[in-house]
């Protein structure tokens, strides 16, 4: 079975000043819950959007 947590991810190109480590997939660090029917493509798109929004918040030098 393909890994969910220990998946080898392609790095997302971002400015060197920021580091984003976010898992792709239905992650739950407890032992009680978990699970949605979302596709990997959907989750990947959301991840990129969130990362893009975070990058936009970084103050740029004048």
């Amino acid at each position: 079975m393909r890994n969910i947590f220990k998946r080898n991810q392609e790095p997302i190109v971002a400015p060197a000043t920021t580091t984003a480590t976010m898992p792709i997939g239905p992650v739950d660090n407890s032992t009680e819950s978990g699970g949605a029917g979302e596709s990997q493509e959907d989750m990947f798109a959301k991840l990129k959007e969130k990362l893009f929004n975070e990058i936009n918040k970084i103050p740029l030098p004048p």
């Epitope: 079975m1 393909r2 969910i4 947590f5 220990k6 998946r7 392609e10 660090n29 029917g37 990997q40």
Partner: antibody
């Protein structure tokens, strides 16, 4: 060599709980996820969920959420699956299988047969 | 959930003859990483499942080259060029592109 040794067959009463085990050997337990699969004649093979033994992180098939709880004991390199509120629908063979990147070697336990009957 | 549909249900083949099994998914299995996580496994009578093919067409170690996997998107095929006695059992396709991972219903290969 990699081995996944599962616990023996179980016969349990409806309404009870049972905890199945899967002891890993031949590799570093925390380096790989452990996945669980259910097999019945009616529904065939069904993926239940997975656990990362390193962090305790779990992911479940929505169908088995509330039915199965996955845990792992790093000290004994053993993964566990507890099934609660058992009914005849839970009678099946349950397999543990080591996670991979979708391409490296695939390993399965020998299976544990669970019979729920009064 | 992704539905995996296999056909035929049963396949009765003479030793030395070819065999072909179809697997269709309800959605494309192409992942965002460009890979298609479609696998085939064989479960021999009384044994645990054993993966034969991963990423549509790649053979696991020890699997004879008479087995070939092909396909893309939603349509996949497992072919055995010359069936041997050790090939009997139930063949399953499964996908681990989309969560939750799902299996086909199985195809039983019988020897005539």
């Amino acid at each position: 060599q990699v081995q996944l040794q599962q616990s023996g067959a179980e016969l349990v009463r409806p309404g009870a709980s049972v905890k199945l085990s899967c002891k890993a050997s031949g590799y570093t337990f925390t380096d790989y996820e452990m996945h669980w699969v259910k097999q019945t004649p009616v529904h065939g093979l069904e993926w239940i969920g997975a656990i990362d033994p390193e962090t305790g992180g779990t992911a479940y098939n929505q169908k088995f959420k509330g039915k199965a709880t996955l845990t792992a004991d790093k000290s004994s390199s053993t993964a566990y699956m507890e099934l609660r509120s058992l009914t005849s629908e839970d009678s099946a063979v349950y397999y543990c299988t080591r996670g991979n990147d979708g391409y490296n070697e695939d390993y399965w336990g020998q299976g544990t047969s669970l019979t729920v009957s009064s | 959930d992704i539905v995996m549909t296999q056909s035929p249900l049963t396949l009765s083949v003479t030793i030395g003859q070819p065999a072909s099994i179809s697997c269709k998914s309800s959605q494309s299995l192409l992942d965002s990483d460009g890979k298609t996580y479609l696998n085939w496994l064989l479960q021999r009578p009384g044994q645990s499942p054993k993966r034969l093919i991963y990423l549509v067409s790649k053979l696991d170690s020890g699997v004879p080259d008479r087995f070939t996997g092909s396909g893309s998107g939603t349509d996949f095929t497992l072919k055995i060029s010359r069936v041997e006695a050790e090939d009997l059992g139930v063949y399953y396709c499964w996908q681990d592109t989309h969560f939750p991972y799902t299996f086909g219903g199985g195809t039983k290969l019988e020897i005539k």
